[in-house]
């Protein structure tokens, strides 16, 4: 039992549990498709344990293979809304440092308004996560129907 | 090498490994919106290890973050049939104790007959987590099909 | 601190990590719905850390309870294809053993050209995980848009 | 609840057409498939066809060749059933149904009936 | 279309006694964890009125003496204890797809 204890008075981050749930703060401006996110407990259910937010964007702190998922609504759509503002996509992927850029995660949303995945990736110390929303509809920013976070797994 | 084997004798809910995978039992009277659940291996390959059901619904016994996911496909469903009955909504969210209440997990099924999704997002001992499925439609009770679960990530 | 360096220094089998994920390498022949993986650094992200491939399909060597998860992504598709060639069904299953056998996740493309889930099950070593993708339709190989894994959650 | 409100009997010639008319009480007329069955006269059930009032959408058993069209008027939450080329086997009581909660084809509600006799 | 087959065609039973009615259909009528199998009762100059739905739901009103079961294509109505007001013809309804189709009918009697 001794051992159980002596794991819980350990700093977490030495486990490596990193961790981050966040919500939609805004768009960007017209020509830039990326979505900026925010967390804290201030704001209601979103957090980071470990990794940052840079400018909107999610800061990598620890390597590792992560746990990488997001929903997002768009708003006021309806599936024909949808069908007409196709092709409405979402990427999420590596967009700094350069040298690793790459879409980690895409879907369009076709006749749907809500898009939802998840994926396993290795990423590093600095890896900036960004995702991008391309079409002219406007994402929700209801914290339960928008959100985007990542999972420390294992190193 | 000991420790690994000492880690192993530990009780594995000191380790704060709750987790549980429910299949839909039943849904409710006309006037209550909520699935409600069930879980076991007798029942297949469902199970609790932590959280416990109340009544159908999913009680937290262990405080921390937690990753909620769930899959709901509509019975005798077709992309018809889904855009007729639009809207059709899934929401997840804590509905005891009502000081904490909060929807945490919002789809629409729009011109499709399966919501899938899943989020981090911090838990207390005691939340009772609800699914309501709000429509004219009836949920698959097929396993492969609709399923709700949760797993404790980190304190 | 010295505990968790020594945590640090035992190798990550004996803590349970079992993780993969992997892209699609290409269909079956005709007759045949599964669907044929790969994964390595070689090949970009995708990894295999505890399980292995046979023949294209994931064979699990630990057991224990596992989150499963795929996204598929039909290839030069709209939803008028898609709804065009429905039936298209996902199916993620325990192809192997024989006595094993069971549909495990299973989803319609119905109006939409991706879906993606995951699910918390059980699994046992010598588990061969198969996913069966009928109808008319090519998957994408794009590897941001078709992927499945699997991670160990606890035993 | 809901009250299913069906229009008088009527007696029709061979070749004429029939319409029928229910009318449903509460605010729900328009996310409930209304169904159309008739029963012949000491005879079992048929299922003619439905209509989604939402959207107008029909579903028509092929038995009926063409010779059934359903509508709805959503601004007075009412269906109709209109049946052609009438013959004397069209004799028959038909019911408008719907469902209580789920839109599933089974039938909670029924209208009181409407007899229609074909005769020359 | 499905094809729905009840037997017996007529039943006499006693006050008190055991009714069971079974209806076959020509293919399964179950789909998604359910059985779209449905029971209704008709009196002379009255619309059908509905019993059980989905297989073995008793719908809201009727008297706990009526059950139904069964899954695939086999279903069964029982009726626990025949009262003098079950006097009535009974008809099996599947939803599994369109057209929805009914059995012939059974017509219950007092013996």
């Known amino acids: 039992q001794r051992f159980a204890q002596a794991q819980q008075q350990l700093p977490l981050e030495s486990l490596g549990w990193d961790v981050a749930e966040l919500q939609l703060n805004h768009t960007g401006p017209q020509q830039d498709p990326r979505l900026y996110w925010q967390g804290g407990p201030a704001l209601g259910r979103s957090f980071l344990h470990g990794p940052e937010l840079d400018k909107g964007q999610l800061r990598i702190h620890r390597d590792g293979i992560y746990m990488v998922h997001i929903q997002v609504t768009l708003a006021i759509c309806s599936s024909t809304t949808a069908s007409r503002h196709h092709p409405t996509t979402l990427a999420v992927g590596i967009c700094s440092p350069a040298s690793r850029s790459i879409s980690l995660l895409r879907l369009s949303f076709h006749q749907g308004c809500t898009i939802a995945s998840q994926r396993l990736t290795p990423l590093a110390r600095g890896d900036t996560l960004c995702t991008n929303l391309t079409g002219t509809l406007l994402p929700s920013r209801n914290t339960d129907e928008t959100f985007f976070g990542v999972q420390w797994v294992r190193p | 090498q000991r420790f690994a084997q000492a880690q192993q004798q530990l009780p594995l809910e000191s380790l704060g490994w709750d987790v549980a995978e429910l299949q839909l039992n039943h849904t409710g009277p006309q006037q209550d919106p909520r699935l409600y659940w069930q879980g076991g291996p007798a029942l297949g390959r469902s199970f609790l290890h932590g959280p416990e059901l109340d009544k159908g619904q999913l009680r937290i016994h262990r405080d921390g973050i937690y990753m909620v996911h769930i899959q709901v496909t509509l019975a005798i469903c077709s992309s018809t049939t889904a855009s007729r009955h639009h809207p059709t909504t899934l929401a997840v969210g804590i509905c005891s104790p009502a000081s904490r209440s909060i929807s945490l997990l919002r789809l629409s099924f729009h011109q499709g007959c399966t919501i899938a999704s899943q989020r981090l997002t911090p838990l207390a001992r005691g939340d009772t987590l609800c699914t309501n499925l709000t429509g004219t439609l009836l949920p698959s009770r097929n396993t492969d099909e609709t399923f709700f679960g949760v797993q404790w990530v980190r304190p | 601190q010295r505990f968790a360096q020594a945590q640090q220094q035992l190798p990550l089998e004996s803590l349970g990590w079992d993780v993969a994920e992997l892209q699609l390498n290409h269909t079956g022949p005709q007759q045949d719905p599964r669907l044929y993986w790969q994964g390595g650094p070689a090949l970009g992200r995708s990894f295999l850390h505890g399980p292995e491939l046979d023949k294209g399909q994931l064979r699990i060597h630990r057991d224990g309870i596992y989150m499963v998860h795929i996204q598929v992504t039909l290839a030069i598709c709209s939803s008028t294809t898609a709804s065009r060639h429905h039936p298209t069904t996902l199916a993620v299953g325990i192809c192997s053993p024989a006595s094993r056998s069971i549909s495990l996740l299973r989803l319609s493309f119905h109006q939409g050209c991706t879906i993606a889930s995951q699910r918390l099950t059980p699994l046992a070593r010598g588990d061969t995980l198969c996913t069966n993708l009928t109808g008319t339709l090519l998957p994408s190989r794009n590897t941001d848009e078709t992927f499945f894994g699997v991670q160990w959650v606890r035993p | 609840e809901v009250q299913l409100v069906q229009s008088g009997a009527e007696v029709k010639k061979p070749g004429s057409s029939v319409k029928v008319s229910c009318k449903a009480s509460g605010d729900t007329f328009p996310r409930y498939n209304m169904h159309w069955v008739r029963q012949a006269p000491g005879q079992g059930l048929e299922w003619m066809g439905a209509i989604f009032p939402g959207n107008g959408e029909t579903s028509y058993n092929q038995n009926f060749k063409g010779r059934v069209t359903l509508t709805a008027d959503k601004s007075t939450s009412t269906a109709y059933m209109e049946l052609s080329s009438l013959r004397s086997e069209d004799t028959a009581v038909y019911y408008c149904?719907?469902?209580?909660?789920?839109?599933?084809?089974?039938?909670?509600?029924w209208g009181q009936g409407t007899l229609v006799t074909v005769s020359s | 279309d499905i094809v729905m087959t009840q037997s017996p065609d007529s039943l006499a039973v006693s006050l008190g006694e055991r009714a069971t009615i079974n209806c076959r259909a020509s293919k399964s009528v179950s789909s998604s964890g359910y059985s779209f199998m449905h029971w209704y009762q008709q009196k002379p100059g009255q619309p059908p009125k509905l019993l059980i739905y989905?297989?073995?739901n008793l719908e809201s009103g009727v008297p706990d003496r009526f059950s139904g079961s069964g899954s695939g294509t086999d279903f069964t109505l029982t009726i626990s204890s025949l009262q003098a007001e079950d006097v009535a013809v009974y008809y099996c309804?599947?939803?599994?797809?369109?057209?929805?189709?009914f059995g012939q009918g059974t017509k219950l009697e007092i013996k």
């Open positions: 149904a719907r469902n209580s909660y789920y839109d599933y084809a089974w039938f909670t509600y």
């Open positions: 309804q599947h939803s599994r797809e369109f057209p929805p189709t």
């Open positions: 989905l297989a073995s």
